[in-house]
């Protein structure tokens, strides 16, 4: 039997994926559970199998269609159910009505590249992935740069309060190795949260020019 305190949290990537995590204190690790999604105004429904990610939590991705297809809109409500197998039948463990565009978490930005690098500055660009056209320009970004001898957690956050898919890093040290990451967040949504950080982009500033002999 499954009992104890439970949590059921899902996010929509704004296109064709709903990712869910179900946690249950006292649940058996080998319990077979799934998430079932029923939109209120669509002909389709979808199921995914919850797989263990830790001692008491399971996760799965509801794949609603092709990665860039717009499967849900701002007016959709999706009823999400957690079902766990008990003997020969499925038992409903939780029911949640979910407004996709109130629960957004986009995919991490991709295609990071150095556009131009100098001794003290570096221009970097990136792209957003699988983001709805509904946002138009209503996105913001956070970026961070890893300096030698520091950790990511120590890196100051740079905030871009508009849809700007590039940044010019300044006051860098010449001939130094850095790493850079960026994440994205739509402006709308009661529970909307930051995307995961992008894969780090490594770059090196150019050496300072040698002084000329007199």
């Amino acid at each position: 039997a499954v009992n104890g305190t439970s949590q059921f949290t899902c996010f929509y990537n704004s296109r064709a994926n709903i990712s869910c995590v179900w946690s249950q204190d006292g649940a058996l690790q080998d319990t077979s559970c799934q998430v079932h999604a029923w939109p209120d105004r669509r002909r389709w429904n979808q199921t995914c199998e919850l797989l263990p990610v830790s001692q008491a939590s399971w996760a799965c991705n509801l794949i609603l269609g092709a990665p860039d297809s717009q499967k849900l809109t701002t007016v959709d409500i999706v009823t999400l159910r957690v079902l766990c197998r008990e003997g020969v039948r499925w038992r409903v463990m939780a029911i949640q009505d979910f407004k996709p565009f109130e629960n957004l978490r986009l995919m991490a930005p991709i295609s990071l590249q150095v556009v131009h690098v100098e001794t003290h500055r570096c221009n970097i660009s990136w792209e957003i992935s699988q983001a709805s056209h509904y946002f138009e320009r209503h996105l913001e970004f956070e970026a961070r740069t890893l300096s030698p001898g520091h950790t990511w957690e120590e890196a100051p956050l740079l905030t871009l309060k508009q849809k700007q898919e590039w940044i010019c890093l300044e006051t860098l040290t010449p001939d130094t190795q850095y790493e850079f990451q960026v994440r994205v967040k739509p402006l709308q949504g009661e529970f909307t949260t930051w995307s995961p950080w992008s894969q780090p982009l490594a770059f090196r500033t150019k050496p300072a020019a040698l002084g000329k002999d007199t």
Epitope: T9, Q96, K99, E102, E190, F191
Partner: nanobody
Framework: EVQLVESGGGLVQAGGSLRLSCAAS????????MGWFRQAPGKEREFVAA????????MYAVSTEGRFTCSRDNAKNTVYLLMNSLKPEDTAVYYC????????????????????WGQGTQVTVSS
């Protein structure tokens, strides 16, 4: 703080529908998570549904089996409970409640999580 008044209860035949309303006054409605509970004669108060401040997530008791829909209209300071395919076992006094603390909409809240309660409205389902 808000005051809550439920309405919309009554007598309905099994298989029928009712829509309960809970009107809030005297506070900032959008700063409260809202819930519905019910209490049948001789039984404990039972959770029915709870919705977050903006309505982005709503949790339902498994016993509702997808027959109930809870929604809120922050412009009208009202939360609703639409009950379809009603059964005799749905007979109870239905209470609206407000929670001042933050509610994520990812778990089943306890009645003790709610600070403010309405006076209740009777729902009777006949067979």
């Amino acid at each position: 703080e808000v005051q809550l008044v439920e309405s919309g209860g009554g007598l309905v035949q099994a298989g029928g529908s009712l829509r309960l309303s809970c009107a809030a006054s005297g506070g900032t409605f959008s700063s409260y998570a809202m819930g519905w509970f019910r209490q049948a004669p001789g039984k404990e108060r039972e959770f029915v549904a709870a919705t977050t401040r903006g309505g982005g997530r709503t949790m339902y008791a498994v016993s509702t089996e997808g027959r109930f829909t809870c929604s809120r209209d922050n412009a009208k300071n009202t939360v609703y409970l639409l009950m379809n395919s009603l059964k005799p076992e749905d007979t109870a006094v239905y209470y609206c409640a407000a929670m001042t603390s933050y509610y994520s909409g990812t778990y089943y809240p306890d009645s003790s999580d709610f600070d403010i309660w309405g006076q209740g409205t009777q729902v009777t389902v006949s067979s």
